[in-house]
Interface confidence: low
């Protein structure tokens, strides 16, 4: 579901989840008591939203959406939520939530949950924090301003005519001279790339004419010719000055190395916090909501609403229901246990040093740690064919009745020339196994050591059916490795 | 593939090597999607327009060591896609047999997009550049990126048809490379990896700003089984 | 690709006034400048006005006060306006564009494009 994070008109139908006054204090949860015992809770309020400790307005204050503080000097405050941009928009029109639904030319939207006339990847239910609502001009990419897939199938998309907000625009997020998470809220001076060419001059159209201008990306204060991320990318980065190379990611040092930001990330737990740690989880946990946020390996998770090191999609905003608070271990996917992503850019993610509870009353189980070995079972293990079984290399070495087998490469007690690891190099013929080198129908066979008898089938129990092996899923889980 | 890892033994097992019946040299991958047909690259089957010239193993983790689950099928048809897309079909001469180690990946539903940013996974014996693997099976995490993104100047520049995706790391140092070609790009769909790509070119391997482009296999699954029907 | 077609020429006395139209079609994806250009027998092509998306102008000194160039964003069309036409006004004019076209998907792939012509004769 799509939750709006601005407001209409003085904001009491705003169900978004600013939690923080506009002073910076944090809000206290509208069901406390302390420090400030409430008039409106939701007990007194159940409709007005009062969930959790987020900025409401349940008796219609003209000043817009506020809370209770959790600093005992400050009753309440107000918080500063943007205005919906419904009928104009700020900046690029990232938020934009208006419904203009025609492009510059006149020509009407596709709807963005529709693939015709324009096939695309661009999936409202893959994207919810984007409000890909109806056929609605929307700017999920970081373009300059909102667009459209177009009904008409010789253009396949198209620029919207929004008018731009004349109001203030909303407060800026902090901002940054070291590089944090993808680096678009860095507003430093670094103005060369990583090859150590000059960065072009955002607002010059030479040696690189481009739409990354100042005019089309008015809050990515692209000044002079300092790296900027103003659409998304992995990285600040910049046009060069070199007529060959059109543009270059830039060398920010990160602030996790630098204590320099201008302001410091509230919503990154400080480190200080020792949380009450849930000590187990039921079942596959995804019910745990414990405080835990460590591996198996020792290493910190990285929070849940970062993107940093590692991008992924593992958001609250795609998962509101999974608890993906902080940097806590929780399992969103129905995987085997609670995991997260690792703070190590080099380890992607890791189940969590957590146990399962007991559900028995019994003793602790241990969730199985990550292995990089296979998960299906072992060649030796595998212990039954398939078909005729002449893939069969199991060690069964005993004929269905019972007798042991002669070895492959022995003579005694019957001479035999057919069948030996000379002449069957790819059979399998190793020591005395039961086995199947000329795909006879009645399955795996060996020379006996019974004088009496040449040959017998030995009894091999049939895998699970091939039937049984469905498209897409293979035995052994895979790595799942991360790119580098 | 460049990056990445060596895969767990087995993990991929749709995964083939197409390789010349005479030499068995590996030149490209390819994917089980049903127990007698292959799907691979157009462009990895200019060697010889006859089918005698290729063979298939299967259940292969080792390029070059034979191991015990391995199978090995020559080819009785090659279907090239009529529209000179770079996709074509192997029939093999007889059915692969299904096993825990070569198992079919599944198709697509026809004309589905995958979404902007979904991960997807491309596996292969191809040119690693270096980054250690090599010989052995790799796997590398890629996001795909929507057409209308990877089309822009700063990456592909207008080369990207609607019949094929984009995946790839903007910042390059993980891709698919030569030898990979024909291989898959497979995503995870609820409990099921389905075939979205099929490898087929890039500009240089897993430099920045150029994702490696797959051919979009939900354009052509209506294609694909009508051969498999009349095959 | 991109193609340019100009309208509005033909003979004129001089003193009166003439509106020469350019419009731009193809996959357009955005144009930056639109710029009108002459040439005469036997001179150099000249720039004699450009409009910047953003509706910036800059003329030509010997065109200066007399003409105006104008551009409908949305319909892909630059125009200039010729008052107080003079015999030496008289060549062929010609349209130029820059900016990014479209293809199979949304691309920035560059494109400058000119324009076939239209003559503007200025009789005395």
């Known amino acids: 579901v799509y939750l709006s994070e601005c407001k209409t008109g003085i904001g009491n139908g705003y169900r978004g989840t600013m939690s923080r006054t506009k002073s910076g204090v944090a809000c206290q949860k509208w069901g406390a008591t302390f420090p400030h015992v409430p008039n409106y809770s939701p007990s007194t309020h159940p409709n007005e939203g009062l969930e959790e400790n987020y900025c409401r307005n349940p008796d219609n204050d003209e000043q817009g959406p506020w809370c209770y503080t959790t600093d005992p000097d400050k009753r309440y405050d107000y918080c500063n939520i943007p205005e919906c941009e419904e009928e104009c928009m700020y900046c690029s029109g990232e938020k934009y939530e208006g419904k203009i639904s025609k492009t510059m030319s006149g020509l009407d939207c596709q709807a963005w949950d529709s693939q015709s006339p324009h096939a695309h990847g661009y999936i409202p239910a893959k994207f919810p924090s984007k409000n890909l609502k109806m056929n609605y001009c929307r700017n999920p990419d970081g373009e300059p301003r909102p667009w459209c897939f177009t009904t008409d199938p010789t253009k396949r998309w198209e620029y919207c005519d929004i008018p731009r907000c004349t109001t203030p625009p909303p407060p800026p997020s902090p901002t940054y001279q070291c590089l944090k998470g993808r680096g678009e809220n860095y507003r430093g001076t670094v103005s060369v790339t990583v090859s150590g060419k000059t960065c072009q001059r955002w607002s010059e159209q030479t040696p690189h004419r481009h739409n990354r201008t100042p005019e089309n990306f008015p809050c990515k204060n692209l000044e002079e010719n300092y790296c900027r991320n103003p659409d998304g990318e992995t990285a600040p980065w910049c046009y060069t000055t070199d007529s060959q190379l059109r543009w270059e990611y830039c060398e920010i040092p990160s602030c996790e190395s630098s204590a320099s930001p201008d302001q410091s990330d509230s919503s990154v737990p400080p480190e200080e916090q020792t949380p009450v740690v849930q000590e187990c989880y039921q079942s596959d946990g995804q019910s745990y909501r414990g405080t835990s946020s460590t591996t198996i390996t020792g290493k910190k998770c990285q929070s849940w609403a970062a993107m940093f090191p590692h991008r992924h999609s593992k958001t609250p905003e795609n998962f509101p229901d999974a608890g993906l608070e902080m940097n806590y271990c929780r399992n969103p996917d129905g995987d085997k246990g609670p995991w997260c992503y690792t703070t190590d850019p080099s380890v992607r993610w890791e189940y969590c040093n957590l146990k399962r509870c007991s559900e028995t009353g019994g003793s602790v189980v241990e969730l199985p740690t990550v292995s990089q070995e296979p998960s299906g079972p072992s060649d030796s293990e595998t212990d039954c064919m398939y078909g005729n079984g002449k893939d069969y290399r199991g060690k069964t070495a005993v004929t269905a009745a019972g007798t042991p087998c002669q070895g492959w490469a022995a003579q005694e007690p019957h001479r035999h020339s057919i069948f030996t690891p000379q002449t069957n190099p790819r059979a399998g013929l190793e020591k005395n196994y039961c086995r199947n080198p000329d795909g006879d129908v009645n399955g795996p066979w060996c020379y006996t050591t019974n004088p009496r008898k040449l040959y017998d089938y030995c009894d091999i129990p049939l895998c699970a059916s091939a039937s049984s092996f469905e498209c897409g899923k293979p035995q052994v889980e895979p790595k799942k490795c991360p790119g580098r | 593939v460049v990056g990445g890892c060596v895969a767990n033994p087995h993990s991929w097992p749709w995964q083939i090597s197409l390789r010349t019946r005479f030499t068995g040299q590996h030149f490209c991958g390819g994917t089980l999607i049903a127990p007698e047909w292959v799907l691979t690259a157009a462009h990895c089957l200019e060697k010889s327009s006859r089918p005698e010239f290729y063979k298939v193993i299967l259940g292969a983790h080792e390029e070059y060591i034979r191991g015990l689950d391995v199978q090995e099928i020559s080819v009785a048809k090659l279907i090239l896609e009529p529209n000179n897309r770079d996709i074509a079909l192997l029939k093999l001469s007889r059915p692969a047999t299904i096993t825990d180690k070569v198992i079919p990946a599944c198709l697509p539903s026809p004309n589905y997009m995958v979404a902007d940013r979904t991960i997807c996974y491309i596996t292969g014996w191809g040119e690693t550049q270096g980054t250690f693997g090599a010989g052995r099976l790799k796997e590398a995490q890629l996001p795909v990126i929507e057409n209308k993104v990877c089309n822009r100047v700063e990456y592909l520049n207008n080369r990207v048809k609607s019949t094929e995706l984009c995946a790839g790391q903007l910042a390059g140092g993980v891709d698919s490379c030569q030898g990979d070609s024909g291989g898959p790009l497979v995503c995870f769909e609820k409990d099921k990896y389905i075939l979205q790509g099929v490898t087929s070119w890039g500009l240089g391997c897993a430099r920045p700003n150029k994702p490696g482009v797959y051919v979009r296999v939900s354009r052509f699954v209506d294609w694909i089984e009508r051969e498999m029907r009349n095959n | 690709q991109v193609q340019l077609v100009e309208t509005g020429g033909g003979l004129v006395q001089a003193g009166g006034s003439l509106r020469l139209s350019c419009a731009a079609s193809?996959?357009?994806?955005?144009?930056?400048?639109m710029d009108w250009y002459r040439q005469a027998p036997g001179k150099e092509r000249e720039l004699v006005a450009a409009?910047?998306?953003?509706?910036?102008?800059n003329y030509a000194d010997s065109v200066k006060g007399r003409f105006t160039i104008s551009r409908d964003n949305a319909k892909d069309t630059v125009y200039l306006q010729m008052n107080s036409l003079k015999p030496e006004d008289a060549a062929f004019y010609y349209c130029?564009?820059?900016?990014?076209?479209?293809?199979?998907?949304?691309?920035?792939?560059?494109?400058?494009?000119w324009g076939q012509g239209t003559q503007v004769t200025v009789s005395s």
């Open positions: 193809g996959n357009i994806f955005s144009i930056n400048a």
């Open positions: 130029n564009a820059d900016g990014y076209y479209s293809d199979y998907d949304k691309n920035l792939a560059e494109f400058n494009s």
């Open positions: 409009i910047t998306s953003g509706g910036t102008t």
